[in-house]
């Protein structure tokens, strides 16, 4: 079975800069999985932002602004990475990567 | 409707290069990771190369390592392929296909013939 | 890399009939496994994906089955516009491979 392990427990930002989480995956190839990012602000339903695919397709919530997420994969080391551009009050929240394995 | 365009495809000798491009249309070009497939006369398909939606990570089949290179330029909805130190065995009718999650390669090109010979 | 062989090479069938392709893999490819048909002079067309999802507008007779390492495609009651080649393609890891494909002939 796969296992999903985020290494940053929180990560602090200051206002405009740019906040990078990481995904790393064990247990199951990431090179033919797809990965998802989703968020959770406080006191909201989770929400999915962005996911990418086995060769690099990206599908993301309508509603995101244009240019404000970057989803990366890099199989070599089984990590995907969720890149949030200039961070603002209202990206407060906890960031869940996933995947679906058969 | 999804569209996409090969061109750049001719004759050429061996040892020289070869720009191939791939014009999209009908479809968010910059979301999607895109592929090159080619197929010698009278044979199978042979995937070529692969690049993500925004260029960060590329594959390549072996056969075509470190002489042929995937690029795109999404403000131009256009992928391509430079092809260098061209060899008999590369001549083919190369596709550009569209990827994607489940249901990759669901569009492709009409194809380009490359032919290599002296 | 992963070696995808596909029998028989050649399928000779009458229109009706049903006809069944096997794509055989190295490896297990789970079910990332996709068909394809080719027609002469034409582009490929995706048929199946992930072993047995057929594409959009796809005809019903279309099947696909299998995971691991073993597949089929089953054509239930070929029409005449199916005598094509058909190919498998795994893309469980890089590079991508595609099978040999099986000729798909009018008897």
């Known amino acids: 079975a796969g296992h999903l392990e985020q290494p940053q427990i929180s990560s602090t930002k200051t206002l405009s800069k740019t906040a990078r989480l990481e995904c790393v995956v064990s247990g199951i190839t990431i090179s033919a999985t797809s990965v998802y990012w989703y968020r959770e602000r406080p006191g909201e339903v989770i929400q999915f932002l962005v996911s990418i695919s086995y060769d690099g397709t990206v599908r993301k919530e309508s509603g995101i602004p244009s240019g404000k997420f970057e989803v990366d994969r890099i199989p070599e080391t089984s990590t995907s990475t969720l890149t949030i551009h200039n961070v603002e009050k209202q990206d407060i929240a906890t960031y869940y990567c996933a995947l679906w394995e058969v | 409707e999804v569209q996409l365009v090969e061109s750049g495809g001719g004759v050429v000798q061996p040892g020289k290069s070869l720009r191939l491009s791939c014009t999209a249309s009908g479809f968010t070009f910059g979301t999607y990771g895109m592929h090159w497939v080619r197929q010698a006369p009278g044979k199978g398909l042979d995937w070529v190369a692969v690049?993500?939606?925004?260029?960060?990570?590329?594959y390549y089949a072996d056969s075509v390592k470190g002489r042929f290179t995937i690029s795109r330029d999404n403000s131009k909805n256009t992928l391509y392929l430079q092809m260098n130190s061209l060899r008999t065995e590369d001549t083919a009718v190369y596709y550009c296909?569209?990827?994607?999650?489940?249901?990759?390669?669901?569009?492709w090109g009409q194809g380009t013939l490359v032919t290599v010979s002296s | 890399d992963i070696v995808m062989t596909q029998t028989p090479a050649t399928l000779s069938l009458s229109p009706g009939e049903r006809a069944t392709l096997s794509c055989r893999a190295s490896?297990?490819?789970?079910?990332?496994l996709a068909w394809f048909q080719q027609k002469p002079g034409q582009a490929p067309r995706l048929l199946i994906y992930?072993?047995?999802n057929r594409a959009t507008g796809i005809p019903a007779r279309f099947s696909g089955s299998g995971s691991g390492t073993d597949f089929t495609l089953t054509i239930s009651s070929l029409e005449p516009e199916d005598f094509a080649v058909y190919y498998c393609q795994q893309r469980s890891n890089w590079p991508l491979t595609f099978g040999g494909g099986t000729k798909v002939e009018i008897k």
């Open positions: 296909a569209r990827g994607g999650f489940g249901e990759s390669f669901d569009s």
């Open positions: 690049i993500w939606y925004n260029g960060s990570n590329k």
């Open positions: 992930d072993a047995s």
């Open positions: 490896q297990s490819v789970i079910d990332y």
